[in-house]
Interface confidence: medium
C-alpha cells in the first residue's frame, strides 16, 4: 500500500510538470505565431495589424498582454463604450500592456489639424515608429472604463531620455470638449502638465482641467488663439508649459518661437524634442506572468 501511495504521488508530480510544460509550450507557440505575423511591421506593409482572431475583444493593450501576447505591435482594441474597434500600437516592453495614444518621431505627420481630425484620430497606424494621435473620442472611451496611468517618454537630440508619469489620466467627453484630468506626478522630466514647477504660475501654466483646443475650436484661457499660434491641437491654457503635438523641428533649438514639441521643465520653451511617446495602462495593472 505504501508503495502504491508513493507511486501515485510520483505520477501526480509528473502530471503537474507535464501540464506546466504544455502551458509553456502554448505560450511559446503563441509568441512564435505573433512574431511570424509581425515580421511586416518595419516594412510598413498595409497589413501590419496583428490579427488575434475573433476569440475575444480586448478593451486595451493590457488585456492583450495578459492574454499572452508579449510582442509590441499594432493590435485592434475596443474599449467598453466604443461603438467600433480601432488599431493601436501596444508597447509590450517597459513592463508591458501599454496602449500608445500618441507618438512623435520624425515629423512625417502634420499635427496642425482641426477639431474633427483630433477628435477621430489621425496618422500612421502602420509603421512601428509611425506618428499618430489616437483621437480624443477614443481617449475618452479608453480612460472612462477604468483608472489609467499616463506615461510620457521623452527624448532629446543629445541622446538623453526622461519620462513623466501621471496617475488617473482621464479625457472628458465631447460635451466637455475632451477636458484633461491628471493625478499624481512622478518621473524625471518634471511636472509640466500640471504646471507644478512654481506655485505662482499654475493659473496660466497648468494643463489640468483644460479643454482641448484646435485652430478651429478655441477653448483656451488666452485672449488670442493658442492652437493657431502654436500650430497644434492640445489642452492649452495660456498657452502651455507642455505641448507634445507641437511643430516637429529637426534640431534642438531650430524653433523661432515656442511652438515646437515642448516639455518646459526639462528643456524649456525653446527646445523642440526629438521624440515623444504618450502611453497609458491601468493604474492597477499586474502582468499575468505564466
Amino acid at each position: 500500500l505504501e508503495d502504491c501511495a508513493q507511486e501515485q504521488m510520483r505520477l501526480r508530480a509528473q502530471v503537474r510538470l507535464l501540464e506546466t510544460r504544455v502551458k509553456q509550450q502554448q505560450v511559446k507557440i503563441k509568441q512564435l505565431l505573433q512574431e511570424n505575423e509581425v515580421q511586416f511591421l518595419d516594412k510598413g506593409d498595409e497589413n501590419t495589424v496583428i490579427d488575434l482572431g475573433s476569440k475575444r475583444q480586448y478593451a486595451d493593450c493590457s488585456e492583450i498582454f495578459n492574454d499572452g501576447y508579449k510582442l509590441s505591435g499594432f493590435y485592434k482594441i475596443k474599449p467598453l463604450q466604443s461603438p467600433a474597434e480601432f488599431s493601436v500600437y501596444c508597447d509590450m516592453s517597459d513592463g508591458g500592456g501599454w496602449t500608445v495614444i500618441q507618438r512623435r518621431s520624425d515629423g512625417s505627420e502634420n499635427f496642425n489639424r482641426g477639431w474633427k481630425d483630433y477628435e477621430n484620430g489621425f496618422g500612421n497606424f502602420v509603421q512601428k515608429h509611425g506618428e499618430y494621435w489616437l483621437g480624443n473620442k477614443n481617449l475618452h472611451f479608453l480612460t472612462t472604463q477604468e483608472d489609467y496611468t499616463l506615461k510620457i517618454d521623452l527624448a532629446d537630440f543629445e541622446k538623453n531620455s526622461r519620462y513623466a508619469q501621471y496617475k488617473n489620466f482621464k479625457v472628458g467627453d465631447e460635451k466637455n470638449f475632451y477636458e484633461l484630468n491628471i493625478g499624481e506626478y512622478s518621473g524625471t522630466a518634471g511636472d509640466s502638465l500640471a504646471g507644478n514647477f512654481h506655485p505662482e504660475v499654475q493659473w496660466w501654466a497648468s494643463h489640468q482641467r483644460m479643454k482641448f483646443s484646435t485652430w478651429d475650436r478655441d477653448h483656451d484661457n488666452y485672449e488670442g488663439n493658442c492652437a493657431e499660434e502654436d500650430q497644434s491641437g492640445w489642452w492649452f491654457n495660456r498657452c502651455h508649459s507642455a505641448n507634445l503635438n507641437g511643430v516637429y523641428y529637426s534640431g534642438p533649438y531650430t524653433a523661432k518661437t515656442d511652438n515646437g514639441i515642448v516639455w518646459y521643465t526639462w528643456h524649456g520653451w525653446w527646445y523642440s524634442l526629438k521624440s515623444v511617446v504618450m502611453k497609458i495602462r491601468p493604474n492597477d495593472f499586474i502582468p499575468n506572468v505564466i
Epitope: D191, A194, H198, P199, E200, Y253, Y264, T265, W269, W270
Partner: antibody
Framework: EVQLVESGGGVVQPGRSLRLSCAAS????????MHWVRQAPGKGLEWVAL????????YYADSVKGRFTISRDNSKNTLYLQMNSLRAEDTAVYYC?????????????WGQGTLVTVSS | EIVMTQSPDSLAVSLGERATINCKSS????????????LAWYQQKPGQPPKLLIY???TRESGVPDRFSGSGSGTDFTLTISSLQAEDVAVYYC?????????FGGGTKVEIK
Amino acid sequence: EVQLVESGGGVVQPGRSLRLSCAASGFTFSSYAMHWVRQAPGKGLEWVALISYDGSLKYYADSVKGRFTISRDNSKNTLYLQMNSLRAEDTAVYYCARDRGYGSWYFDYWGQGTLVTVSS
Amino acid sequence: EIVMTQSPDSLAVSLGERATINCKSSQSVLYSSNNKNYLAWYQQKPGQPPKLLIYWASTRESGVPDRFSGSGSGTDFTLTISSLQAEDVAVYYCQQYYSIPLTFGGGTKVEIK
C-alpha cells in the same frame, strides 16, 4: 559670454519720467524672463518688476504698480523700464537681471546697474 | 508678501574660520508639489552687482567655491562659509522666489576680524 548693460539713468525731478534700457547679449534673450531689481544708496535689494520671455506676463512690486511699466523688444534684445511719476524714494541703482528659468524666479546674471536720482 | 529676515546684520570672522548667516521667512517657501525650497543666496561686493551663490536653498551655482553651502527648509535657512577667505568680504542676501512679490532679506555684512 552673457552681458547685460543698463542705460538711461540720471537726475530727474519728482513727478517726471525716465526710461531705462537694458541691452542683452551672449544668450538667447527671447528665451528668458527678465527682471528689474533696485538698490537705494547704502540699502538692500528690492525687486521691482518681472516680464515673461514673450512679454505676455508682467508682475510688479506694490511700490511701483501703476507708475512703472516693464517691456521688452526681443528683436532688439532689449529690456525696458518706463518710470513715470517718479518720487524721491525711487532713487536707487537699477539693475536688470536674467531669470534662471525652468520654473524659478531667481537671478543668475546681473548688469552693472544704472543710477537714478530723483531730486528737486 | 513674504518677509525675509536675516541675522546677524554684520559678522566679523577670522580668516580660515567658519561664518554662519541665518535667514528666516515669514511663511514657508517649501513647495509641497515638488518638495523644493524656493530660496536663493547672493553675494555682493562693494561697487559690484550681486552674484548668485546658492539656489533651491542648497544647490551651489557652478563656479562657486565649495566652502559656500546652504541648508535649511520651510522657514529657516543658513548660508555657511566653512573657511573664510579675504575675497569673501561682502554683503550676503537671501531671496525667496516662492511668490510675488519676490523679496530679499536685509543683508548680512561679513568682515574679517
